[in-house]
Amino acid sequence: EEELQVIQPDKSVSVAAGESAILHCTVTSLIPVGPIQWFRGAGPARELIYNQKEGHFPRVTTVSESTKRENMDFSISISNITPADAGTYYCVKFRKGSPDTEFKSGAGTELSVRAKPSAPVVSGPAARATPQHTVSFTCESHGFSPRDITLKWFKNGNELSDFQTNVDPVGESVSYSIHSTAKVVLTREDVHSQVICEVAHVTLQGDPLRGTANLSETIRVPPTLEVTQQPVRAENQVNVTCQVRKFYPQRLQLTWLENGNVSRTETASTVTENKDGTYNWMSWLLVNVSAHRDDVKLTCQVEHDGQPAVSKSHDLKVSAHPKEQGSNTAAENTGSNERGSSDYKDDDDKHHHHHH
């Protein structure tokens, strides 16, 4: 009779996380009598996976009925595989004794676990930045195996090239993580832009995972201001508007100053949105020129998104020609000021009046 051999036909087996792994093992003889054991790893630190003779192994089932006569198939199935199960598994024949003694081992089957990467999480800078500045975005994905993985960055569908990627750990591990940092130059048109981190892995069957960050969370587009004097609406009244254009985000506070004194403060609420995602807003001030003897310096001061205020001034000249219309002149008279604001282009019939 030829001496028993332990045959493990598969050098390697690859299984997706969550599935069952079948590890094949047959012996070539019924002699010697004794149980089969399965181990992960070799040497004194090997881990017992299954012992035919004794023990409780809830995740392991035998593929064939080991109690049946002349059974020589000791293949096992391990359920609910996780990356932690990766390793080399040995089918070992023991010889009956007190205690049973190891007789012969199979050559081993390497189990590799294909684990999907987690959904990429993209995070941007803590503080907003303005156009022309370069900002960093990070992308992280975890828990994948094997180690080979591809990560790409896109901005609005255009692939980025300025990024650095690390896969950890460097050595062998049950699973891996990827971390990438991309540099993105902001433009004024980026409110609607998206930065996308795309991860491709063998487990994803050609359907990469994507993580996105909206640049609307990152960008601050400072407003441009224009102060203009409208034609006289009524005797002794001049309408001065402050056009606040192309700003983002919406958080904005506007203060009117007359000769340096605060006249009115308001917060942008109803705004118009531009196609590029920025906002426009207009505030107007009705000045009763009869109340002023001297020229009036009107200042539109805007504090945007908590940043230092920017302002634009307009000189309102007080002259002896009450009905003359012009950008810098108005009739001299006395009376109260009327102030107001509007987000409408046609201020004649849509504005609101506030009397003081």
Epitope: Q52, G55, E70, K96
Partner: antibody, heavy 119, light 110 residues
Framework: QVQLVQSGAEVKKPGASVKVSCKAS????????INWVRQAPGQGLEWIAM????????HYNQIFKDRATLTTDTSTSTAYMELRSLRSDDTAVYYC????????????WGRGTLVTVSS | DIVLTQSPDSLAVSLGERATINCRAS??????????IFWYQQKPGQPPKLLIY???NLDSGVPDRFSGSGSGTDFTLTISSLQAEDVAVYYC????????FGQGTKLEIK
């Protein structure tokens, strides 16, 4: 190590039934067959039947097929052999034995249970 | 059913001498290249003990003065040098199909 501990001696009247137990330890009960063998005083060994505790598959010696029933309780790793319609010639030591190689052999034996059938 | 017949029924051998017990099957007990014959030793007041499995393989812990041979229908248990502790009844058993035992051979010291 493997141990098979059998229930104590029984005295039965003819026509009665006896149920002998065999509690296994030191191994996974459902992975190996249990055989039952008897030996009348001064006589040889007589195979009664065998059971696979994993699925309760049984094989009986034709002589005992109508009178013997093998069962197991996997929760307690115990095998049972019930013999009905006892006769005086059923007086014997009843052994349970575990088949370690699935060869239908008897590798480990219990110490035996003496069943005496007498009126 | 396969019937096993042992010979002799009893045997007396001097200490240190060879003892040979035969077992004949009514038909072949061979299957898949294996001879399904087993030998047991039973001492008074004790359960049987497996000595030899599949005709020629020594069970664990059994002294190597015991050996088994044969194939098909004819099998032999040999004790090469009888020791006092070998006094016992010896049984052959087959499992080619459902198990049966031989009638036993009583071994004594001459």
């Amino acid at each position: 190590q493997v141990q098979l501990v059998q229930s104590g001696a029984e005295v039965k009247k003819p026509g009665a039934s006896v149920k002998v137990s065999c509690k296994a330890s030191g191994y996974t009960f459902t992975n190996y067959w249990i055989n039952w063998v008897r030996q009348a005083p001064g006589q040889g060994l007589e195979w009664i039947a065998m059971i696979d505790p994993s699925d309760s598959e049984t094989h009986y010696n034709q002589i005992f097929k109508d009178r013997a029933t093998l069962t197991t309780d996997t929760s307690t790793s115990t095998a049972y052999m019930e013999l009905r319609s006892l006769r005086s010639d059923d007086t014997a030591v009843y052994y349970c034995a575990m088949d370690y190689g699935s060869l239908y052999a008897m590798d480990y034996w219990g110490r035996g249970t003496l069943v005496t059938v007498s009126s | 059913d396969i019937v096993l017949t042992q010979s002799p029924d009893s045997l007396a051998v001097s200490l240190g001498e060879r003892a040979t017990i035969n077992c004949r099957a009514s038909k072949s007990v061979s299957s898949s290249g294996y001879n399904y014959i087993f030998w047991y030793q039973q001492k008074p007041g004790q359960p049987p003990k497996l000595l030899i499995y599949l005709a020629s393989n020594l069970d664990s812990g059994v002294p190597d003065r015991f050996s088994g041979s044969g194939s098909g229908t004819d099998f032999t248990l040999t004790i090469s040098s009888l020791q006092a502790e070998d006094v016992a009844v010896y049984y052959c058993q087959h499992s080619r199909d459902l198990p049966t035992f031989g009638q036993g051979t009583k071994l004594e010291i001459k």
